[in-house]
Protein backbone atom coordinates (compact mmCIF):
# COMPACT_ATOMS: atom_id res chain seq x y z
CA UNK A 1 0.00 0.00 0.00
CA UNK A 2 3.09 2.49 -0.73
CA UNK A 3 2.21 5.87 -2.99
CA UNK A 4 5.29 6.57 -5.55
CA UNK A 5 8.23 9.00 -3.99
CA UNK A 6 8.06 11.82 -6.31
CA UNK A 7 9.13 14.49 -3.47
CA UNK A 8 12.84 14.67 -1.45
CA UNK A 9 10.04 15.21 1.80
CA UNK A 10 8.24 12.41 2.00
CA UNK A 11 7.92 9.04 0.69
CA UNK A 12 6.63 5.30 1.84
CA UNK A 13 3.24 6.54 3.20
CA UNK A 14 1.51 3.18 3.92
CA UNK A 15 -0.78 1.41 6.40
CA UNK A 16 1.22 -1.01 8.77
CA UNK A 17 -1.50 -3.65 10.21
CA UNK A 18 -1.11 -6.31 12.84
CA UNK A 19 -4.09 -8.28 14.50
CA UNK A 20 -6.45 -5.20 13.37
CA UNK A 21 -3.52 -2.27 15.15
CA UNK A 22 -3.15 0.11 12.30
CA UNK A 23 -0.38 1.94 12.16
CA UNK A 24 0.10 4.55 9.73
CA UNK A 25 3.74 5.12 8.77
CA UNK A 26 5.87 7.20 6.22
CA UNK A 27 9.70 8.09 5.66
CA UNK A 28 11.33 11.22 5.30
CA UNK A 29 12.71 12.29 1.99
CA UNK A 30 16.69 12.75 1.83
CA UNK A 31 15.10 16.85 1.44
CA UNK A 32 13.22 16.25 5.19
CA UNK A 33 15.07 17.64 8.17
CA UNK A 34 14.72 17.47 12.24
CA UNK A 35 12.50 20.37 11.71
CA UNK A 36 10.36 18.99 9.15
CA UNK A 37 6.75 18.24 10.78
CA UNK A 38 3.82 15.93 9.50
CA UNK A 39 0.00 16.24 9.87
CA UNK A 40 -2.22 13.17 9.19
CA UNK A 41 -5.80 13.26 8.18
CA UNK A 42 -7.98 9.95 7.03
CA UNK A 43 -11.31 9.21 5.58
CA UNK A 44 -13.58 6.44 4.72
CA UNK A 45 -13.83 5.55 1.49
CA UNK A 46 -16.42 7.16 -0.69
CA UNK A 47 -16.58 10.11 1.29
CA UNK A 48 -15.09 13.39 0.16
CA UNK A 49 -14.12 14.97 3.86
CA UNK A 50 -11.30 14.50 4.99
CA UNK A 51 -10.71 14.33 8.97
CA UNK A 52 -7.63 15.82 10.82
CA UNK A 53 -6.39 13.21 13.38
CA UNK A 54 -6.13 15.03 16.58
CA UNK A 55 -2.62 14.17 18.37
CA UNK A 56 -1.05 13.71 15.31
CA UNK A 57 -0.63 17.32 13.67
CA UNK A 58 2.45 18.90 13.19
CA UNK A 59 4.22 16.15 14.91
CA UNK A 60 8.31 14.85 14.74
CA UNK A 61 7.60 11.33 14.69
CA UNK A 62 6.68 9.26 11.65
CA UNK A 63 4.12 7.20 12.47
CA UNK A 64 0.06 7.18 14.06
CA UNK A 65 -2.28 5.10 14.96
CA UNK A 66 -5.30 5.38 13.14
CA UNK A 67 -6.86 2.03 14.72
CA UNK A 68 -10.07 3.61 16.32
CA UNK A 69 -10.80 5.76 12.92
CA UNK A 70 -10.30 2.51 10.98
CA UNK A 71 -11.80 0.00 12.94
CA UNK A 72 -14.66 -0.91 10.94
CA UNK A 73 -13.26 -4.00 9.08
CA UNK A 74 -16.01 -4.33 6.40
CA UNK A 75 -14.96 -0.45 5.22
CA UNK A 76 -12.50 1.06 3.07
CA UNK A 77 -10.04 4.17 4.37
CA UNK A 78 -7.94 6.36 2.56
CA UNK A 79 -5.36 8.36 4.77
CA UNK A 80 -2.62 11.19 3.61
CA UNK A 81 0.20 12.94 5.83
CA UNK A 82 1.16 16.36 4.53
CA UNK A 83 4.73 17.02 5.22
CA UNK A 84 5.69 20.81 5.85
CA UNK A 85 10.10 21.54 6.26
CA UNK A 86 10.89 25.59 7.28
CA UNK A 87 10.48 28.02 4.31
CA UNK A 88 9.35 24.85 2.04
CA UNK A 89 6.11 24.35 0.40
CA UNK A 90 3.98 21.67 2.11
CA UNK A 91 3.83 18.15 0.55
CA UNK A 92 1.18 16.04 0.55
CA UNK A 93 0.89 12.16 0.01
CA UNK A 94 -2.00 9.38 0.18
CA UNK A 95 -1.96 6.03 0.80
CA UNK A 96 -3.49 3.29 -1.60
CA UNK A 97 -6.81 2.11 -0.06
CA UNK A 98 -6.75 0.39 2.72
CA UNK A 99 -8.76 -2.83 4.34
CA UNK A 100 -7.43 -3.78 7.58
CA UNK A 101 -9.48 -6.91 6.93
CA UNK A 102 -7.72 -8.13 3.54
CA UNK A 103 -4.20 -6.71 4.66
CA UNK A 104 -3.40 -6.77 8.33
CA UNK A 105 -1.10 -9.09 9.69
CA UNK A 106 -1.83 -12.03 11.73
CA UNK A 107 0.75 -12.29 15.10
CA UNK A 108 1.32 -15.05 16.76
CA UNK A 109 -0.94 -16.82 18.67
CA UNK A 110 -0.72 -16.74 22.42
CA UNK A 111 -0.23 -20.37 23.66
CA UNK A 112 0.05 -22.61 26.85
CA UNK A 113 2.06 -26.20 26.57
CA UNK A 114 1.90 -28.21 29.70
CA UNK A 115 4.08 -31.31 29.65
CA UNK A 116 3.16 -34.32 31.28
CA UNK A 117 4.71 -37.86 31.62
CA UNK A 118 4.00 -39.12 28.01
CA UNK A 119 1.76 -36.20 26.21
CA UNK A 120 2.20 -32.73 25.95
CA UNK A 121 -0.91 -30.23 25.73
CA UNK A 122 -1.01 -26.80 24.06
CA UNK A 123 -3.45 -24.56 25.19
CA UNK A 124 -4.30 -21.83 22.52
CA UNK A 125 -5.74 -18.62 24.06
CA UNK A 126 -8.33 -16.55 22.09
CA UNK A 127 -6.70 -13.53 20.65
CA UNK A 128 -8.62 -10.33 20.97
CA UNK A 129 -8.17 -7.34 18.73
CA UNK A 130 -9.21 -3.68 18.88
CA UNK A 131 -12.24 -4.49 16.79
CA UNK A 132 -15.43 -3.84 18.89
CA UNK A 133 -19.05 -5.54 18.36
CA UNK A 134 -21.83 -3.36 18.84
CA UNK A 135 -22.44 -4.03 21.94
CA UNK A 136 -18.73 -3.02 22.86
CA UNK A 137 -16.61 -6.10 23.16
CA UNK A 138 -13.73 -6.15 22.19
CA UNK A 139 -13.42 -9.26 18.96
CA UNK A 140 -11.33 -12.07 18.99
CA UNK A 141 -9.36 -12.99 15.74
CA UNK A 142 -11.92 -16.30 16.11
CA UNK A 143 -15.03 -14.68 15.99
CA UNK A 144 -13.74 -12.51 13.05
CA UNK A 145 -12.65 -15.35 10.48
CA UNK A 146 -14.94 -18.44 9.94
CA UNK A 147 -12.04 -20.45 8.47
CA UNK A 148 -9.52 -19.33 11.32
CA UNK A 149 -7.74 -22.61 12.52
CA UNK A 150 -5.15 -23.20 14.27
CA UNK A 151 -1.98 -25.89 12.91
CA UNK A 152 0.32 -27.74 15.64
CA UNK A 153 3.60 -29.07 15.11
CA UNK A 154 5.51 -31.20 17.51
CA UNK A 155 8.95 -31.69 16.76
CA UNK A 156 10.36 -34.81 17.75
CA UNK A 157 13.75 -35.19 16.63
CA UNK A 158 15.22 -33.88 13.05
CA UNK A 159 13.30 -36.22 11.52
CA UNK A 160 10.09 -36.94 12.61
CA UNK A 161 7.17 -34.10 13.25
CA UNK A 162 3.56 -34.46 14.56
CA UNK A 163 0.81 -32.77 13.73
CA UNK A 164 -2.62 -31.59 14.60
CA UNK A 165 -4.70 -28.94 13.14
CA UNK A 166 -8.32 -27.48 13.98
CA UNK A 167 -10.69 -24.85 15.20
CA UNK A 168 -10.67 -26.06 18.82
CA UNK A 169 -8.90 -24.37 21.74
CA UNK A 170 -7.07 -27.65 23.08
CA UNK A 171 -5.08 -29.82 21.85
CA UNK A 172 -2.73 -32.92 22.86
CA UNK A 173 -0.02 -34.61 21.52
CA UNK A 174 0.39 -38.21 22.88
CA UNK A 175 1.97 -41.45 23.38
CA UNK A 176 5.63 -39.29 23.66
CA UNK A 177 8.67 -40.42 25.41
CA UNK A 178 9.12 -39.28 29.24
CA UNK A 179 11.83 -37.18 29.97
CA UNK A 180 12.51 -36.02 26.48
CA UNK A 181 12.56 -32.62 24.82
CA UNK A 182 10.51 -31.25 22.41
CA UNK A 183 9.82 -28.30 19.89
CA UNK A 184 6.40 -27.04 19.76
CA UNK A 185 5.11 -24.69 17.18
CA UNK A 186 1.68 -23.60 16.67
CA UNK A 187 0.87 -21.20 13.95
CA UNK A 188 -2.71 -19.48 12.93
CA UNK A 189 -4.36 -19.82 9.03
CA UNK A 190 -7.48 -18.20 7.83
CA UNK A 191 -7.29 -19.97 4.32
CA UNK A 192 -10.01 -17.68 2.37
CA UNK A 193 -7.69 -14.42 3.05
CA UNK A 194 -4.64 -16.40 2.74
CA UNK A 195 -3.17 -15.09 6.49
CA UNK A 196 -0.57 -16.82 8.18
CA UNK A 197 1.15 -16.07 11.25
CA UNK A 198 4.54 -16.56 12.30
CA UNK A 199 4.66 -19.49 14.87
CA UNK A 200 4.47 -19.49 18.51
CA UNK A 201 7.51 -21.44 19.99
CA UNK A 202 7.86 -23.53 22.84
CA UNK A 203 10.35 -25.76 24.30
CA UNK A 204 9.25 -28.50 26.90
CA UNK A 205 10.16 -31.75 28.35
CA UNK A 206 7.76 -34.43 29.19
CA UNK A 207 8.02 -35.54 33.17
CA UNK A 208 9.92 -38.37 34.35
CA UNK A 209 8.50 -41.38 34.60
CA UNK A 210 8.32 -41.79 38.44
CA UNK A 211 5.95 -44.71 38.48
CA UNK A 212 8.87 -47.99 38.25
CA UNK A 213 10.84 -46.12 41.00
CA UNK A 214 8.89 -46.75 43.68
CA UNK A 215 7.19 -50.09 42.85
CA UNK B 1 -27.99 -29.84 28.43
CA UNK B 2 -27.05 -27.48 24.33
CA UNK B 3 -30.54 -27.82 22.81
CA UNK B 4 -31.43 -26.06 19.99
CA UNK B 5 -35.40 -26.02 19.03
CA UNK B 6 -36.29 -24.82 15.15
CA UNK B 7 -39.28 -23.31 14.14
CA UNK B 8 -41.66 -21.30 10.93
CA UNK B 9 -41.11 -24.07 8.66
CA UNK B 10 -44.35 -24.70 6.26
CA UNK B 11 -46.33 -24.81 3.31
CA UNK B 12 -45.33 -21.40 0.82
CA UNK B 13 -46.01 -20.68 -2.48
CA UNK B 14 -42.80 -20.09 -5.26
CA UNK B 15 -42.02 -16.32 -4.56
CA UNK B 16 -43.07 -16.28 -1.09
CA UNK B 17 -41.07 -15.86 2.23
CA UNK B 18 -40.68 -17.63 5.64
CA UNK B 19 -38.45 -16.61 8.65
CA UNK B 20 -37.88 -19.48 10.42
CA UNK B 21 -36.51 -19.28 13.82
CA UNK B 22 -33.98 -21.51 16.73
CA UNK B 23 -34.22 -21.28 19.89
CA UNK B 24 -30.91 -21.80 22.26
CA UNK B 25 -29.77 -22.71 25.29
CA UNK B 26 -26.95 -24.41 27.25
CA UNK B 27 -24.24 -22.67 26.28
CA UNK B 28 -23.30 -18.78 25.57
CA UNK B 29 -25.25 -18.45 22.32
CA UNK B 30 -23.84 -14.61 22.55
CA UNK B 31 -20.29 -15.56 21.35
CA UNK B 32 -20.55 -18.48 18.67
CA UNK B 33 -21.07 -19.32 15.26
CA UNK B 34 -24.69 -20.52 14.58
CA UNK B 35 -25.51 -22.28 11.40
CA UNK B 36 -28.52 -23.02 9.05
CA UNK B 37 -28.31 -26.43 7.31
CA UNK B 38 -30.69 -27.99 4.91
CA UNK B 39 -31.63 -31.08 3.57
CA UNK B 40 -33.93 -31.75 0.61
CA UNK B 41 -36.16 -35.07 0.43
CA UNK B 42 -34.09 -37.63 0.25
CA UNK B 43 -30.90 -35.88 -0.61
CA UNK B 44 -27.55 -34.99 0.97
CA UNK B 45 -26.84 -31.94 3.57
CA UNK B 46 -25.86 -28.17 2.91
CA UNK B 47 -24.88 -25.60 4.42
CA UNK B 48 -26.95 -22.41 3.45
CA UNK B 49 -25.17 -19.43 5.92
CA UNK B 50 -23.28 -19.02 8.76
CA UNK B 51 -23.34 -15.58 11.54
CA UNK B 52 -21.11 -14.93 14.35
CA UNK B 53 -23.28 -13.96 17.50
CA UNK B 54 -20.99 -11.69 18.53
CA UNK B 55 -19.37 -10.12 15.39
CA UNK B 56 -22.04 -10.35 13.56
CA UNK B 57 -20.17 -11.18 10.25
CA UNK B 58 -22.30 -13.59 7.70
CA UNK B 59 -21.31 -15.89 5.33
CA UNK B 60 -24.22 -17.15 2.93
CA UNK B 61 -23.76 -20.58 0.35
CA UNK B 62 -24.11 -18.93 -3.58
CA UNK B 63 -27.32 -19.94 -3.93
CA UNK B 64 -29.26 -18.53 -1.23
CA UNK B 65 -27.18 -14.74 -1.37
CA UNK B 66 -29.91 -12.26 -2.01
CA UNK B 67 -32.34 -13.81 -1.01
CA UNK B 68 -31.93 -15.13 2.63
CA UNK B 69 -30.85 -13.14 5.63
CA UNK B 70 -29.18 -14.97 8.64
CA UNK B 71 -29.54 -12.89 11.84
CA UNK B 72 -29.99 -13.40 15.53
CA UNK B 73 -31.41 -11.67 18.43
CA UNK B 74 -28.95 -12.15 21.43
CA UNK B 75 -31.15 -11.31 24.09
CA UNK B 76 -33.70 -13.91 23.54
CA UNK B 77 -30.81 -16.43 22.26
CA UNK B 78 -32.72 -17.01 19.13
CA UNK B 79 -31.32 -17.54 15.39
CA UNK B 80 -33.11 -16.70 13.06
CA UNK B 81 -33.12 -16.91 8.80
CA UNK B 82 -35.52 -15.04 6.66
CA UNK B 83 -36.43 -16.56 3.60
CA UNK B 84 -37.59 -14.58 0.64
CA UNK B 85 -38.23 -15.28 -2.71
CA UNK B 86 -38.25 -18.56 -2.21
CA UNK B 87 -37.55 -21.22 -4.91
CA UNK B 88 -39.49 -24.85 -5.29
CA UNK B 89 -35.66 -25.89 -5.07
CA UNK B 90 -35.92 -24.22 -0.93
CA UNK B 91 -37.78 -27.24 -0.34
CA UNK B 92 -35.91 -29.03 2.32
CA UNK B 93 -35.66 -29.69 6.10
CA UNK B 94 -33.94 -26.84 7.54
CA UNK B 95 -31.58 -27.39 10.84
CA UNK B 96 -29.62 -25.04 12.92
CA UNK B 97 -26.43 -26.44 14.05
CA UNK B 98 -23.86 -24.38 16.48
CA UNK B 99 -19.76 -24.59 17.05
CA UNK B 100 -19.30 -25.22 20.42
CA UNK B 101 -15.12 -25.85 21.32
CA UNK B 102 -14.64 -25.87 17.66
CA UNK B 103 -16.95 -28.62 16.85
CA UNK B 104 -20.17 -28.39 14.82
CA UNK B 105 -21.50 -31.20 16.95
CA UNK B 106 -25.07 -29.95 17.69
CA UNK B 107 -28.24 -29.90 15.72
CA UNK B 108 -31.61 -29.06 16.22
CA UNK B 109 -34.31 -31.76 15.32
CA UNK B 110 -34.98 -29.48 11.96
CA UNK B 111 -38.04 -27.86 10.55
CA UNK B 112 -39.77 -28.83 6.60
CA UNK B 113 -39.81 -25.88 4.55
CA UNK B 114 -42.04 -26.73 1.60
CA UNK B 115 -42.30 -24.23 -1.45
CA UNK B 116 -44.84 -25.41 -3.90
CA UNK B 117 -48.40 -23.71 -5.61
CA UNK C 1 -16.14 -23.96 -3.23
CA UNK C 2 -14.35 -27.30 -2.24
CA UNK C 3 -16.29 -30.23 -3.78
CA UNK C 4 -16.58 -33.69 -1.22
CA UNK C 5 -16.55 -37.04 -3.56
CA UNK C 6 -17.81 -39.63 -1.04
CA UNK C 7 -18.01 -43.19 -2.49
CA UNK C 8 -19.71 -45.63 -2.86
CA UNK C 9 -22.95 -43.79 -2.52
CA UNK C 10 -24.46 -47.41 -0.52
CA UNK C 11 -23.43 -50.63 0.65
CA UNK C 12 -24.70 -53.90 1.76
CA UNK C 13 -22.70 -54.94 5.06
CA UNK C 14 -23.41 -58.01 7.23
CA UNK C 15 -23.34 -57.72 11.16
CA UNK C 16 -19.93 -57.96 11.96
CA UNK C 17 -18.13 -56.95 8.80
CA UNK C 18 -15.63 -54.39 8.32
CA UNK C 19 -16.81 -50.99 6.22
CA UNK C 20 -14.58 -48.72 4.97
CA UNK C 21 -16.34 -45.34 2.79
CA UNK C 22 -14.03 -42.79 0.76
CA UNK C 23 -14.07 -39.33 0.81
CA UNK C 24 -11.88 -37.11 -2.11
CA UNK C 25 -11.51 -33.26 -1.68
CA UNK C 26 -11.22 -31.15 -4.50
CA UNK C 27 -8.48 -29.65 -2.92
CA UNK C 28 -5.82 -30.13 -0.09
CA UNK C 29 -7.53 -29.72 3.29
CA UNK C 30 -4.86 -31.10 5.83
CA UNK C 31 -7.28 -32.74 8.07
CA UNK C 32 -10.21 -30.26 8.62
CA UNK C 33 -12.71 -33.40 7.66
CA UNK C 34 -15.77 -34.60 10.03
CA UNK C 35 -17.61 -37.50 9.43
CA UNK C 36 -21.37 -38.05 10.32
CA UNK C 37 -23.58 -40.44 10.66
CA UNK C 38 -27.08 -40.09 10.38
CA UNK C 39 -30.47 -41.88 10.69
CA UNK C 40 -33.56 -41.04 8.76
CA UNK C 41 -35.29 -38.39 10.29
CA UNK C 42 -32.36 -37.03 12.37
CA UNK C 43 -30.39 -34.67 12.48
CA UNK C 44 -26.60 -35.40 11.78
CA UNK C 45 -24.34 -37.29 14.93
CA UNK C 46 -20.50 -36.31 14.73
CA UNK C 47 -18.20 -39.23 15.17
CA UNK C 48 -14.73 -38.31 13.90
CA UNK C 49 -13.71 -34.54 14.11
CA UNK C 50 -9.84 -33.62 12.63
CA UNK C 51 -10.06 -36.57 10.19
CA UNK C 52 -8.42 -39.26 12.53
CA UNK C 53 -9.86 -38.32 16.46
CA UNK C 54 -13.04 -39.89 17.62
CA UNK C 55 -15.72 -37.86 19.30
CA UNK C 56 -16.18 -38.32 23.12
CA UNK C 57 -18.60 -41.28 23.57
CA UNK C 58 -18.48 -42.78 19.92
CA UNK C 59 -17.36 -46.38 20.04
CA UNK C 60 -13.88 -47.40 19.21
CA UNK C 61 -15.49 -49.43 16.09
CA UNK C 62 -15.47 -46.08 14.30
CA UNK C 63 -11.92 -45.11 12.51
CA UNK C 64 -10.98 -41.78 10.47
CA UNK C 65 -8.15 -41.52 8.37
CA UNK C 66 -6.35 -39.39 5.94
CA UNK C 67 -5.30 -35.89 4.92
CA UNK C 68 -4.63 -33.90 2.70
CA UNK C 69 -7.33 -34.66 -0.23
CA UNK C 70 -8.00 -38.48 0.85
CA UNK C 71 -9.97 -39.42 3.86
CA UNK C 72 -11.66 -42.91 5.11
CA UNK C 73 -13.98 -43.84 7.59
CA UNK C 74 -13.88 -47.51 8.93
CA UNK C 75 -16.15 -49.41 10.93
CA UNK C 76 -15.07 -52.24 12.38
CA UNK C 77 -17.30 -54.74 12.88
CA UNK C 78 -21.13 -53.46 12.28
CA UNK C 79 -23.50 -53.03 14.80
CA UNK C 80 -27.40 -53.21 13.80
CA UNK C 81 -27.12 -49.37 15.47
CA UNK C 82 -24.59 -48.51 12.41
CA UNK C 83 -26.99 -49.01 9.82
CA UNK C 84 -27.61 -45.21 8.66
CA UNK C 85 -26.09 -42.65 5.95
CA UNK C 86 -23.13 -41.39 6.90
CA UNK C 87 -21.35 -37.88 5.34
CA UNK C 88 -17.77 -36.58 5.04
CA UNK C 89 -17.82 -32.76 5.73
CA UNK C 90 -14.72 -30.81 4.97
CA UNK C 91 -14.07 -27.95 8.01
CA UNK C 92 -11.76 -25.84 5.81
CA UNK C 93 -13.13 -22.77 4.41
CA UNK C 94 -17.30 -21.69 3.49
CA UNK C 95 -19.05 -22.78 2.20
CA UNK C 96 -18.55 -25.86 4.09
CA UNK C 97 -19.87 -28.51 1.90
CA UNK C 98 -20.28 -32.53 2.70
CA UNK C 99 -19.97 -35.32 0.50
CA UNK C 100 -23.21 -36.78 -1.22
CA UNK C 101 -23.42 -39.56 1.31
CA UNK C 102 -23.20 -43.39 1.76
CA UNK C 103 -25.96 -45.50 3.23
CA UNK C 104 -24.87 -49.15 5.30
CA UNK C 105 -27.92 -51.39 4.62
CA UNK C 106 -28.10 -54.76 5.97
CA UNK C 107 -26.72 -57.56 3.51
Known amino acids: HTTVDTSGLLQHVKFQSSNFENILTWDGGPASTSDTVYSVEYKKYGERKWLAKAGCQRITQKFCNLTMETRNHTEFYYAKVTAVSAGGPPVTKMTDRFSSLQHTTIKPPDVTCIPKVRSIQMLVHPTLTPVLSEDGHQLTLEEIFHDLFYRLELHVNHTYQMHLEGKQREYEFLGLTPDTEFLGSITILTPILSKESAPYVCRVKTLPDRTWAYS | EVQLVESGGGLVQPGGSLRLSCAASGFTFSSSWMYWVRQAPGKGLEFVSVINTRSGITHYVESVKGRFTISTDNAKNTLFLQMNSLKSEDTAVYYC??????????WGQGTQVTVSS | DIQMTQSPSSMSASLGDSVTISCQASENIGTQLFWYQQNAGQPPKLLIYGASRLQTGVPSRFSGSGSGTTFTLTISGVETGDLATYYC?????????FGQGTKVELK
Open chain 2, 97 to 106: ATRIQGLIDY
Open chain 3, 89 to 97: LQDYSWPLT
